[in-house]
Interface confidence: medium
């Protein structure tokens, strides 16, 4: 049925889906607070621009009776049920902020006539790539793949003189939502990562992973996994590791590595951690701007979703353009807007760009140090530490295949 959008005559509403099944176990109250904080900022920005309009959010909660797994497994139906709720109420905002699970976003995108933009904090999977009216404010799997391929091919840095073409991927099925889709993308036989690698095997059992660490007949020295240091320790423990093994630990949404008092445990010495640059968030508190810290990336993505809507609303209103048009629905991409803690860039397909940071453990200081950074917007790697104090021989990353060239 035709749903009218509450999106004109100076009154602009945001529909926020508050789903029980979510990419991250963040209390819905925190997400509400993030949205409300975003609304305050948007109202201020619109007022400063001389635009006397009303912007509000409507929170749409599911009943939680059927879809109560808490994770993303039953999110497909929950998302569609919430859309049905909107349809029955005959009321939709200018924009839909909500589904974070890949399953629900994919299905909702398929099953709705999207004449309005959809903003997601999540939807990491490749199946949500290249969607014309979907914007994703947390790094999707495609961005991770492009970094990995770029890094694998790099061979002209003082600390990486070999191109790599092989990898093991550890994926045991217990991963968080982000990790599940990141590893899913690496596993997929038709993905860019698989296409560019000559050898790739998925390890699904703890024992398979543990055996590879000292297996003289292993086909690759590189193992990719996803999670935090504790996750790695549970799996690896204090087992001996061959000296030319490199574990790439994908842990994008974790700021702990940048905290001053953090010391890297010994089991991290063979590990390169891939995380996101903390951006401006560590700097805000030193300035007189009275911004309450929204540390978690998930809640921050909700907040930035509100700010993105405010940014687009301001542009369209200043240009005298209609908000309830396909042009508005397709406009949430290829732009930079002022996020809560700095500029946020969206690529041509509405996916957030960011600075990924590859960290190593200094054998001297036992601290995490930045080895290089990678700008997803320009697909470019920038070396930072040209003479890292690695655990690996000659302070260089080994070849990915044992016995191929000098180690």
């Amino acid at each position: 049925s035709q749903v009218s959008q509450n999106c004109h005559n100076g009154s602009y509403e945001i529909s926020v889906l508050m789903m029980g099944n979510s990419a991250f176990a963040e209390p819905l109250k925190n997400l509400e607070d993030a949205v409300n904080e975003g609304l305050e900022i948007v109202r201020g920005r619109l007022q400063n621009a001389g635009l006397n309009v009303t912007v509000n959010a409507t929170f749409m909660y599911s009943d939680g009776l059927i879809h109560n797994s808490g994770d993303c497994r039953s999110s497909t139906c929950e998302g569609l049920d919430l859309l049905r709720k909107i349809s029955n109420a005959q009321r939709m905002g200018c924009v839909l902020i909500g589904p974070s699970c890949t399953y629900s976003t994919f299905q909702m995108y398929l099953d709705t006539e999207l004449s309005y933009p959809m903003i997601s904090a999540g939807s990491f999977g490749l199946s949500c790539d290249y969607k014309e009216t979907l914007t994703r404010l947390m790094s999707p799997a495609r961005k991770l793949m492009y970094f990995l391929v770029n890094f694998w091919k790099t061979n002209d840095l003082p600390f990486k003189t070999y191109s790599w073409s092989t990898s093991y991927v550890y994926k045991n099925g217990t991963e968080t939502e982000d990790c599940f889709w990141y590893l899913n993308a690496l596993e997929a036989s038709v993905s860019y990562f698989s296409h560019e690698l000559g050898f790739k095997v998925v390890l699904r059992q703890d024992k398979e992973f543990q055996d590879i660490l000292m297996d003289h007949n292993r086909k690759s020295n590189v193992i990719i996994m996803c999670g935090g240091p504790e996750f790695l320790y549970k799996l690896k423990g204090d087992r001996a590791v061959a000296e030319d093994i490199v574990i790439i630990l994908v842990d994008l949404f974790n700021d702990q590595y940048f905290e001053d008092n953090v010391t890297a445990p010994d089991y991290m010495k063979n590990v390169l951690v891939l995380t996101l640059s903390p951006g401006n968030s560590l700097l805000n508190s030193s300035f007189s701007r009275n911004l309450s810290p929204t540390k978690r990336d998930f809640a921050l993505a909700y907040l930035n979703g509100i700010l993105l809507f405010g940014h687009m609303l301001k542009i369209f209103l200043e240009n005298g353009e209609n908000i309830t048009t396909p042009k508005f629905a397709h406009a949430f991409r290829n732009l930079t807007f002022e996020g809560y803690d700095g500029p946020v860039t969206l690529d041509d397909w509405g996916d957030v760009d960011s600075t990924m940071v590859l960290l190593y453990t200094s054998v001297d200081t036992k601290k995490y140090k930045v080895l290089l950074t990678y700008d997803t917007h320009v697909n470019k790697t920038y070396p930072v530490d040209m003479s890292p104090t690695f655990t690996w021989k000659n302070s260089k990353l080994p070849n990915d295949i044992t016995g191929r060239g000098p180690q």
């Epitope: 940048f258 640059s277 903390p278 951006g279 401006n280 560590l282 700097l283 930079t336 002022e338 700095g342 500029p343 860039t345 600075t355 940071v357 140090k369 930045v370 950074t373 700008d375 917007h377 320009v378 470019k380 920038y382 070396p383 930072v384 530490d385």
Partner: nanobody, 115 residues
Framework: QVQLVESGGGLVQPGGSLRLSCAAS????????MSWVRQAPGKGLEWVAK????????YYVDSVKGRFTISRDNAKNSVYLQMNSLRAEDTGVYYC????????WGQGTTVTVSS
């Protein structure tokens, strides 16, 4: 390689002025906020000022508001700090920093305010 090179420090009398410069290389300068940070003798680091990637927003720590001005020239990959009405408490080593990565620091430039 990511590099930041500061210059322009020196000895100046109270009430005097200095202009600090920072030349950046090895990253897409025009996409990142830049900051000036200082370390007074025997003290910790203090964030002084920061500027948005396009120069349209600037923030200052309270103690320098109205006296210091941060600016940038994206064509030259440079950020500047114009310091007027200098006081003895502004003495220290001044560093520029980028939100691109926290691990890169220049050698700093020393500012001494003394009569």
């Amino acid at each position: 390689q990511v590099q930041l090179v500061e210059s322009g420090g020196g000895l100046v009398q109270p009430g005097g002025s200095l202009r600090l410069s920072c030349a950046a290389s090895g990253f897409t300068f025009s996409r990142y906020w830049m900051s000036w940070v200082r370390q007074a003798p025997g003290k910790g680091l203090e964030w002084v000022a920061k500027i948005k990637y396009d120069g349209s927003e600037k923030y200052y720590v309270d103690s320098v508001k109205g006296r210091f001005t941060i600016s940038r020239d994206n064509a030259k990959n440079s950020v500047y700090l114009q310091m007027n009405s200098l006081r003895a408490e502004d003495t220290g080593v001044y560093y520029c920093a980028t939100d691109f990565t926290r691990d890169v620091w220049g050698q700093g430039t020393t500012v001494t305010v003394s009569s």
